[in-house]
């Protein structure tokens, strides 16, 4: 495929990535799938500047990101290393809280209303952000 040189319509460019901000809510898995169908992934936050950029757009609304620990350790959906990477958890988070009464703990990370991160029940219908890299090869066949 050819390299994507500009963001698709309704996507927003920042530092060689394109972002799409939902205006409705989905469970984490459905949001993850939505992004994959767009040849993208749930947003992976790798720096303070990227954190701020996302906050510029989402405002004070719970919003899923591409970080989960459904299989044990915390993992970013694109393989970015969690342990050495950027983090912006609220104090005392993540806590894998079981007291919500919905069964299980909390395995999916989201931006809270102040932008800092919290782990929550993955079934909650939060907004989400998709991200795709500009220099990633697109899936479209090359022009002849």
């Amino acid at each position: 495929g050819s390299e994507r040189t500009c963001c698709p319509v309704n996507w927003v460019e920042h530092e060689r990535s394109c972002y799409w901000f939902s205006r409705s809510g989905k469970a984490w898995a459905d949001a993850d799938n939505y992004c994959r169908l767009e040849d993208a992934h749930l947003v992976v936050v790798t720096s303070w500047e990227e954190q701020k950029f996302v906050q510029h757009h989402i405002g004070p609304v719970n919003t899923w990101m591409g970080l989960h620990d459904q299989n044990g350790p915390w993992k970013w959906v694109d393989g970015t290393d969690y342990e050495t990477g950027f983090k912006n958890w609220r104090p005392e988070q993540p806590d894998d809280w079981y007291g919500h009464g919905l069964g299980g703990g909390e395995d999916c990370a989201h931006f809270t209303d102040d932008g800092r991160w919290n782990d929550d029940v993955c079934q909650r219908p939060y907004r989400w952000v998709c991200e795709t890299e500009l220099d990633k090869a697109s899936q479209e066949p090359p022009l002849l």
Epitope: V12, E13, H14, K52, F53, Q55, H56, H57, G59, P60, V61, D113, D114, G115, R116
Partner: antibody
């Protein structure tokens, strides 16, 4: 580095019009909402108007609604404020600022004086 | 509309002092509360955004907190360059409101 430079201020008579510009550089202008904030001499900050990154949404303070119009030209990295039917109470330094939920970069301001 | 009350309107303090400025909003809302520093003849500078987050380049002696409808900006140990006017600002829905400002002066 991020820079915002306002221009277009000056002395104008009541009832007349003026257009302010804010030229942005050092960031992807089309990816950010922008707003105008003003400050009357010796007074505090007053929000004026805001525009979304793509220009689709615009909101105004009650004090300027129907008289001021915010717009942007993303191809020119420029934000505008068209001010009509100016009043003495519109006298202020006008700042443009980047962002909707918080203003992380501001211009140096341009002074608008409405006086007969 | 949400009303904001910033206090005190002015404050005299000495280098090394711990000072706190408060902003109260008229209702508990999903909103961003930000703090700006302004020096005479200059543009405002973002210090804290979304109640808690320190803007890049702002010294760690600045901190923000929230308790219900009360937001605070604290400077743990005042430095000479901190003397300025501070404004809180709330973005809620389709409007933005600034507090009246707090002028921080050298005692």
């Amino acid at each position: 580095q991020v820079q915002l430079v306002e221009s277009g201020g000056g002395v104008v008579q009541p009832g007349r019009s003026l257009r302010l510009s804010c030229v942005a550089s050092g960031f992807t202008f089309r990816s950010y909402g922008m707003h105008w904030v003003r400050q009357a001499p010796g007074k505090g900050l007053e929000w004026v108007t805001i525009i979304s990154y793509d220009g689709s949404n615009k909101y105004y303070a009650d004090s300027v609604k129907g008289r001021f119009t915010i717009s942007r030209d993303n191809s020119k990295n420029t934000l505008y404020l068209q001010m009509n039917s100016l009043r003495a109470e519109d006298t202020a330094v006008y700042f443009c600022a980047r962002g909707v939920w918080f203003g992380d970069f501001w211009g140096q301001g341009t002074l608008v004086t409405v006086s007969s | 509309d949400i009303q904001m009350t910033q206090s005190p309107s002015s404050l005299s303090a000495s280098v090394g002092d711990r000072v706190t400025i408060t902003c109260r909003t008229s209702q508990n809302s999903n909103s961003y509360l930000n703090w700006y520093q302004q020096k005479p003849g200059k543009a405002p500078k973002l210090q804290i955004f979304a109640a808690y987050s320190l803007e890049s380049g702002v010294p760690s002696r600045f901190s923000g907190n929230r308790s219900g409808t009360e937001f605070t900006l604290t400077i743990s140990s005042l430095q000479p360059e901190d003397f300025a006017t501070y404004y809180c600002q709330q973005t809620y829905g389709t409007s933005i409101t600034f507090g009246q400002g707090t002028r921080l002066e050298i005692k």
